[in-house]
């Protein structure tokens, strides 16, 4: 039986040009995590991350996608054509895949501030 | 330039082990993740497992998970791969290769080293 | 485990051919796929990696493509020295698994 949540950042907006944190956070399971898969809205990949082997970062994104803090993704150097979902995919065992969901808006505003804040979807 | 000299042919009975070695240099050991496959004559390649010099972490493949293990000795540059209870299916090639920083594909392979299990 | 089915196992063609092979993947790999050449008594070399992207080094003619389930490997034309056998390997999740490779001689 699944019991874990996925808590993520939620709706997030942040400045074109500048950088953003992605993150999720696996609770409420004792299940070890395997690997964790971040996709973007078109669900391509944009990195993996395998507990024991380490980041795989996709070419694509290789500029501009560093990793971590932990298990989330740091994206930087926004454009306008980042405005969209990402999902972070956990895989764990015993209790299978979990899935959780950011929306991420850029911002032509040189005001815009960055708000994250975590949620369960 | 990025080197893997693996150690040389070995040939053993079933049920011994054998221990293969990988010495690596032209790069910073620890950087990359170190992965073992073996090919038996006329197959596929098989992927064993992969260890994490930085960590020591370690991720097999469930048909070898008991009978395989992977260790590093940073100092020295070197992974090893040994497995146990050999039995004549194990005959083999075996080879080292690392993985792309930040990439998962096989950029850099060892020569191989034949392992023969024959009674 | 996802199982990764190649084709055709063999393929005779001659020096100048568009040559072409196919890998199929038994569960969606995103574009989580790379191709090996390895010639006879040699270890495998790298040639394509993430599915489509030239490693460093690789001529111009061999190319990738595909993602999901679907991958092909172009050779766009066949060379002497490209007689090899050929494999795909995806490393979406572990265990890490290769195709069982596409033998290719010259006619």
């Known amino acids: 039986m699944m019991t874990g949540t996925i808590e993520t950042t939620g709706n997030i907006s942040a400045k074109k040009g500048g950088s953003v944190i992605l993150q999720c956070h696996l609770s409420s399971t004792m299940a070890q995590v395997t690997q964790v898969n971040w996709e973007q809205h078109d669900h391509s990949l944009l990195a993996i991350r395998n507990a024991e082997l380490g980041w795989h970062i996709y070419p694509a994104f290789k500029d501009r996608v560093a990793p971590g803090p932990g298990l989330g993704l740091t994206l930087q150097s926004l454009t306008m054509n980042d405005t969209g979902e990402y999902f972070c995919t956990y895989h764990t065992y015993p209790d299978g895949t979990y899935r959780g969901r950011i929306f991420l808006e850029v911002l032509e505003s040189s005001v815009a501030e960055h708000s994250a804040r975590f949620q369960i979807p | 330039q990025v080197q893997l000299v693996q150690s040389g042919a070995e040939v053993k009975k079933p049920g011994a082990s054998v221990k293969v070695s990988c010495k690596a240099s032209g790069y910073t050991f620890t950087e990359n993740a170190m992965h073992w496959v073996r090919q038996a004559p006329g197959q596929r390649l098989e992927w064993i497992g992969g260890?994490?010099?930085?960590?020591?972490?370690?991720s097999y493949s469930q048909k070898f998970q008991g009978r395989a293990t992977l260790t590093v000795d940073t100092s020295a540059s070197t992974a090893y791969m040994e497995l146990s209870s050999l039995r004549s299916e194990d005959t083999a090639v075996y080879y080292c290769t690392r993985s792309s920083y930040y990439r998962y594909d096989l950029d850099y392979w060892g020569q191989g080293t034949t392992v023969t299990v024959s009674s | 485990d996802i199982q990764m089915t190649q084709s055709p196992s063999s393929l005779s063609a001659s020096v100048g051919d568009r040559v072409t092979i196919t890998c199929q993947a038994s569960?969606?790999?995103?574009?989580?796929l790379a191709w090996y050449q390895q010639k006879p008594g040699k270890a495998p070399k790298l040639l394509i990696y993430?599915?489509?992207y030239r490693y460093t080094g690789v001529p111009s003619r061999f190319s990738g493509s595909g993602s999901g389930t679907d991958f092909t490997f172009t050779i766009s034309s066949l060379q002497p020295e490209d007689i090899a056998t050929y494999y795909c390997?995806?490393?979406?999740?572990?265990?890490?698994?290769f195709g069982g490779g596409t033998k290719l001689e010259i006619k």
């Open positions: 993430s599915a489509s």
């Open positions: 390997h995806q490393h979406y999740t572990t265990p890490w698994t």
């Open positions: 260890i994490n010099p930085n960590q020591g972490g370690t």
């Open positions: 569960q969606d790999i995103k574009t989580a």
